[in-house]
Amino acid sequence: EPTMYGEILSPNYPQAYPSEVEKSWDIEVPEGYGIHLYFTHLDIELSENCAYDSVQIISGDTEEGRLCGQRSSNNPHSPIVEEFQVPYNKLQVIFKSDFSNEERFTGFAAYYVATDINECTDFVDVPCSHFCNNFIGGYFCSCPPEYFLHDDMKNCGVNCSGDVFTALIGEIASPNYPKPYPENSRCEYQIRLEKGFQVVVTLRREDFDVEAADSAGNCLDSLVFVAGDRQFGPYCGHGFPGPLNIETKSNALDIIFQTDLTGQKKGWKLRYHGDPMPCPKEDTPNSVWEPAKAKYVFRDVVQITCLDGFEVVEGRVGATSFYSTCQSNGKWSNSKLKCQPVDCGIPESIENGKVEDPESTLFGSVIRYTCEEPYYYMENGGGGEYHCAGNGSWVNEVLGPELPKCVPVCGVPREPFEEKQRIIGGSDADIKNFPWQVFFDNPWAGGALINEYWVLTAAHVVEGNREPTMYVGSTSVQTSRLAKSKMLTPEHVFIHPGWKLLEVPEGRTNFDNDIALVRLKDPVKMGPTVSPICLPGTSSDYNLMDGDLGLISGWGRTEKRDRAVRLKAARLPVAPLRKCKEVKVEKPTADAEAYVFTPNMICAGGEKGMDSCKGDSGGAFAVQDPNDKTKFYAAGLVSWGPQCGTYGLYTRVKNYVDWIMKTMQENSTPRED
C-alpha cells in the first residue's frame, strides 16, 4: 500500500548490525509523486566500491547510489548526511553485510517522503500537445480556442469534418486558409454529385503549401483524394506536386487532410466542378462507330458495326452490329459484345516438346512449337511456327495442319568420356558419358538404347530370357541406385533370324549374327542420363578401318571384381580379324578351330590390355560419326572374345541396319492422331 512517508532502519539499529545479512525495503508512494530519500545516520564498514557491507538505492533498473563508511552532516542546522531525489513513485533499498566486521558498526537511519513532481517540466517527453497544467499529484492538458481535447486526454485538434458538397461547382480550403492550418487534426470533406457526373478537381500550384515529406519520402501532413477504389495522393510540400486537373471518373470524392503536431503551413485551396461522365472512345477492333465523335458523354448512343469477316459472337449469334449507350458510371452498355475474329483455340500439345502459351489464339496470331532441347529435335521440319488461319486451324507453311514431331537426339553424351585408367584395363565412367547404356540384370549384360521404344543388344544376351529387365540412367548398378533409376519393361524380343539357337548355349562356338532388338512397352523419356546412340549410315563412310577408335562401356568383369558396381569404359582400336583368331581361347568349350569368324564381326582391342569381358555383352562399341564429330554411332555390339584383356569380337552393326529398320517399322505403334 503506497504511503506518503516512512522510516528505514538497518537491522538492530542503533545497535551494531549483524554479519551476513541481506535485507531489502520496497518504498512506494502514490502515483503522481516522486520520492525524497534522506539518511540521518550512516556507519557501515568501509570498503572499495562498498564491496563488503553496503546500502544500495535502486530505482527501476538503475542504481541511484551505493553507500558505506561513516558520514556526518555538512550543515549544522540539518541532520541529513546523504539524500536522493527521484521522479518516480517506487524505490528499492537493499542492505548487505558480509561474514565479518573488523569493528562494531551501527548501520543507518533513513527517511522518505512523497514529493510532488512537475510532469510538465521534469521529463524530456512533454505529455501535452498544447498546454500542460501541473497540480500536486498529477497534471492535465488543455487546448487553445477552437481546439478540442482528444480521447487520449493529451492531444488537441480541431473539428473540421462533416462538410458534404453537392453543388456542381464549388471551392474548398483547409481550416484558417491562408493562415496556418491546425496541427494534429484530420479533416474530411465529401463531394457527392448526381450519378452521371464525375468530380473534376482543379488546383493552382501556388494555392498549396503543406509541411514537406521526411527524408524517407513520407508526408508528415498530407492531402489525399479518394474516389471509389482509386486514390490520388498523398500530396505535401511547397506547391502542389500532383496534376493540376484531376478527373476522378466518379461522382463521389472524399478529401482527407491529415496533420501532425508540428510544422504548420498556410494549407491549400481547390476548386471542383461536375463534368458529364465521359465514356472512352474505345478502340474496338474490326468495327466502325456511328456517329463518330471526338468525345462521348453520359447518355450518348452509338451503333457499332463489325467489319467484313468478323461478327458479334456473344449474345445474338451472327449479328453484325449492336448499340451501346454511355452510362452514368462512365462505361458503355453492351461493352462485352465485341467483333471477334475467329479463334483457333488452345494449340494441341506435343510429346517431348512444348508450345508457349499463346498471347492470343485468334485469327492471325502466331505460335511456335519447340522440342525439349538438347535431348529432342524437330524431325519433320517446318520450323515449328504455326499461324491461326481463317478456317480456325493452326497451320504451318510446310506441314499444313500436321503437328511437328519431336524425336530424340542420338549419339550426343551430356559429358564427354575422359579416360582415367582403371571393362578390363578401362576407366571409371559416368552414365552421362554413355547415356545410351542399358543394364540387363539377368543375365548380367548390356545393351544400347537406339530410340524411345527400342534397345539393341546381343542375341546371346536375350536368347535365354525373352523378358529381360533393363535399367537406364544409373552409373551404379547397386540395387539401391537401380531402385531410383528408370526400369524398362520389354514388350517383345526380336532375335536376328541368322542367329543359331542351341540346346546348350554354353558350348557355343558360332556367334555370327549376334544381334537382337527389344521393343519396349512404354517410350523412354530422354534426358542428361538417358539418350539414344545413333545407328551407322549405309554409306562407305561408315566402313571401319584398322586403328579406328571406339568406346565400350559396361558393368562386366574387371581386374578387381566379377561384376563392376559402377560403369566402366575404355577406348580401343579396331584390329584385323586375324588378331582375334590368333588369341588362344581361355576356357575352350570346343576345339580352337571350331570357333567361327565372319565379316559380320569386328575385332578390336589389344592395346594396354583394354577389352570388354563377361557381363559387358550387348553394349555398344561407339565410334565417332565421320559426318558429324559431335555424335557417336553404334558400330558394334559386345559379342564374344577368346580371352579377357586381349582382343574382343563385336557384332558389325552396319551389316544389320536394314534388318533393324525393317523390324522397327513393322513393329512400331501407330501414332494416335
Epitope: F439, D441, N442, W444, T469, Y471, S476, V477, Q478, T479, S480, R481, L482, A483, M487, D562, R563, V565
Partner: antibody, heavy 125, light 107 residues
Framework: QVQLVESGGGVVRPGGSLRLSCAAS????????MSWVRQAPGKGLEWVSG????????GYADSVKGRFTISRDNAKNSLYLQMNSLRAEDTALYYC??????????????????WGKGTTVTVSS | DIQMTQSPSSLSASVGDRVTITCRAS??????LGWYQQKPGKAPKRLIY???NLQSGVPSRFSGSGSGTEFTLTISSLQPEDFATYYC?????????FGGGTKVEIK
C-alpha cells in the same frame, strides 16, 4: 576410409535388454545392406540378422527370431540391433558387417566385405 | 536351414605348404559362397566371394573353387601371416550360415 564402429555392448542380466549400434563412415551407407554377426567366446562365427539398403527387408537366425530386431537410420548412417529377453547363450562378441546387393530384379549378393571391430555382450546373473 | 560342414576342423602345416580346406553344403547353393580369414582378437576378413572370385587386395596364393555343394579354399604356398582360422559362408538363402571353421596352425 571405410569404417564400421560398434557400440552399446555391456553386462546384462538374463531376460534383460540391450541395444547395439553400428556407426558407418567412408561410404554411402544407404547403398548397402548390413548384417550382424556374433562370435561366442572360443567359438565360430554365427550370422544373427541382416537388413537391406532401405530397411524394407530383414532376416534373422532362428536362435534370435522374435527376440532381436534389426533396424537402420540412413539419415544418421547407423545400424541397430535391439536385443530383448537376453539369454546366457547370447553372450558373444557382436560384429556389424557391410553387404552389397547389385541388380534390380535379379539380385547379386556380396556379403560382409567390411567388418567392424565388435562390441562385447555378456549375459550373466 | 542349410548346414555348412567344414573340414578339417584344424590342420598343421609348414611355410610353403599347399593347403586345401573343404566346405560341404547340405543342399545346392550354386556359387553363393564366401571364404573368410580370422586372426585372434581381430575381425574376420573376406578372401573369396562367389566361390571363386578373389577379393581385391588379397594375395593371389589364395583361390576358391567349387559349385553346388562342394567348395574348396586353396592356399598355394602357405606364408607365416596365413596362420589363422578360416570360415566358409553360404548366402544362397536366409538364414546365412557359416562353416564351423578350420584352424591352420604351424607344424
Amino acid at each position: 576410409q571405410v569404417q564400421l564402429v560398434e557400440s552399446g555392448g555391456g553386462v546384462v542380466r538374463p531376460g534383460g535388454s540391450l541395444r547395439l549400434s553400428c556407426a558407418a563412415s567412408g561410404f554411402t551407407f544407404d547403398d548397402y545392406g548390413m548384417s550382424w554377426v556374433r562370435q561366442a567366446p572360443g567359438k565360430g562365427l554365427e550370422w544373427v540378422s541382416g537388413i537391406n539398403w532401405e530397411g524394407g527387408s530383414t532376416g534373422y537366425a532362428d536362435s534370435v527370431k522374435g527376440r532381436f530386431t534389426i533396424s537402420r537410420d540412413n539419415a544418421k548412417n547407423s545400424l541397430y540391433l535391439q536385443m530383448n529377453s537376453l539369454r546366457a547363450e547370447d553372450t558373444a562378441l557382436y560384429y556389424c558387417a557391410r553387404d552389397e546387393q547389385l541388380g534390380g530384379q535379379t539380385y547379386y549378393y556380396y556379403y560382409m566385405d567390411v567388418w567392424g571391430k565388435g562390441t562385447t555382450v555378456t549375459v550373466s546373473s | 536351414d542349410i548346414q555348412m560342414t567344414q573340414s578339417p576342423s584344424s590342420l598343421s602345416a609348414s611355410v610353403g605348404d599347399r593347403v586345401t580346406i573343404t566346405c560341404r553344403a547340405s543342399q545346392g547353393i550354386r556359387n553363393d559362397l564366401g571364404w573368410y580369414q580370422q586372426k585372434p582378437g581381430k575381425a574376420p576378413k573376406r578372401l573369396i566371394y562367389t566361390a571363386s572370385n578373389l577379393q581385391s587386395g588379397v594375395p593371389s596364393r589364395f583361390s576358391g573353387s567349387g559349385s553346388g555343394t562342394e567348395f574348396t579354399l586353396t592356399i598355394s604356398s602357405l606364408q607365416p601371416e596365413d596362420f589363422a582360422t578360416y570360415y566358409c559362408l553360404q548366402y544362397n538363402q536366409v538364414p546365412l550360415t557359416f562353416g564351423g571353421g578350420t584352424k591352420v596352425e604351424i607344424k
